[in-house]
């Protein structure tokens, strides 16, 4: 039975040209995290495997930095980066847990963080 929950940074906004940290946290389970995949709607951004290290997709290599931790830092933001991002936690023995973050990249200098929320 999957008892864990993913806590994410929720709905966030950032300025064009700036950077943002995409972060998820798995709690309420003793399952071992073996890998975390970071995805956009239809493409992979990165994979962090506990043993094999990081994979950064070539289309993001110039502006994605691994970490902090299992998170991902997205740099040189453009308006096209606006959208949904998913953290997929591969765990043993539970299976996969998915968290969702919505990022809005703003033209203006007013960019505030949204509230944190949980996805069961």
């Amino acid at each position: 039975m999957m008892t864990g929950t993913i806590e994410t940074t929720g709905n966030i906004s950032a300025e064009k040209g700036g950077s943002i940290i995409l972060q998820c946290h798995l709690s309420s389970t003793t399952a071992q995290v073996t890998q975390v995949n970071w995805e956009q709607q239809d493409q992979l951004l990165a994979i962090c495997n506990a043993d094999l290290g990081w994979h950064i997709s070539p289309s993001f290599k110039d502006r994605v930095a691994p970490g902090p931790g299992l998170g991902l830092t997205l740099q040189s933001l453009t308006v096209n980066d606006t959208g949904e991002y998913f953290c997929i936690y591969h765990t043993y023995p539970d299976g996969t847990y998915t968290g969702r973050i919505f990022l809005e990249v703003l033209e203006s200098s007013v960019a505030e963080h949204g509230a944190r929320f949980q996805i069961p």
Partner: antibody, heavy 119, light 107 residues
Framework: QVQLVQSGAEVVKPGASVKVSCKTS????????MHWVKQAPGQRLEWIGG????????RNNQKFKGRVTITVDTSASTAYMELSSLRSEDSAVYYC????????????WGQGTLVTVSS | DIQMTQSPSSLSTSVGDRVTITCKAS??????VVWYQQKPGKAPKLLIY???YRYTGVPSRFSGSGSGTDFTFTISSVQPEDFATYYC?????????FGQGTKVEIK
């Protein structure tokens, strides 16, 4: 230039073990993950597992049920794959392969080592 | 484990023809797919990764596309040196898995 040179062919008896080596050169050994891939005659390629020489962490295919041990000697820039309790279906060509820096695609491969399990 | 199924398993073609190979994953693998070429008695060679980027030195006649579960590998105009077996592989989750291969033969 990057090179991966594997040890020579082996003929081993059922129940025994075999240890295949993969000597690398032309790049910084600790920066790239090393993998082992099996190819039995007429079969698809099969990922055995990989190891991150920098931290020593390794991930193995559970199909091999603990019979495989992947290690590295960073001072010799060499990776090893040991397979125990050998049976006839382990007869295959075994390849070492390196994946790129922060990239899982296996970009350089060894020449392969033929292991024949026969009594 | 994620199963990768290629089609066709083999095909006969002539120099100059266009060849398309498909690879279907048993579950979502996003864009974590790679294509290799293997000739008899030789190690595989990386051609395409992620899944539309040509590896260094790979001719432009080779291309790849796809996302999710469906992927395509194309040789726009087959050359004599292209007769070989081609494999897709996913690295979305471990264990990494390969397709069964597609043998491209001379007609």
């Amino acid at each position: 230039q990057v090179q991966l040179v594997q040890s020579g062919a082996e003929v081993v008896k059922p129940g025994a073990s075999v240890k295949v080596s993969c000597k690398t050169s032309g790049y910084t050994f600790t920066e790239n993950t090393m993998h082992w891939v099996k190819q039995a005659p007429g079969q698809r390629l099969e990922w055995i597992g990989g190891i991150n020489p920098n931290q020593g962490g390794n991930r193995n295919n559970q199909k091999f049920k603990g019979r495989v041990t992947i290690t590295v000697d960073t001072s010799a820039s060499t990776a090893y794959m040991e397979l125990s309790s050998l049976r006839s279906e382990d007869s295959a060509v075994y390849y070492c392969a390196r994946s790129g820096l922060r990239d899982y695609a296996m970009d350089y491969w060894g020449q392969g080592t033929l292991v024949t399990v026969s009594s | 484990d994620i199963q990768m199924t290629q089609s066709p398993s083999s095909l006969s073609t002539s120099v100059g023809d266009r060849v398309t190979i498909t690879c279907k994953a048993s579950q979502h693998v996003s864009t974590a797919v790679v294509w290799y070429q293997q000739k008899p008695g030789k190690a595989p060679k990386l051609l395409i990764y992620s899944p539309s980027y040509r590896y260094t030195g790979v001719p432009s006649r080779f291309s790849g596309s796809g996302s999710g579960t469906d992927f395509t590998f194309t040789i726009s105009s087959v050359q004599p040196e292209d007769f070989a077996t081609y494999y897709c592989q996913q690295h979305y989750s471990t264990p990494w898995t390969f397709g069964q291969g597609t043998k491209v033969e001379i007609k």
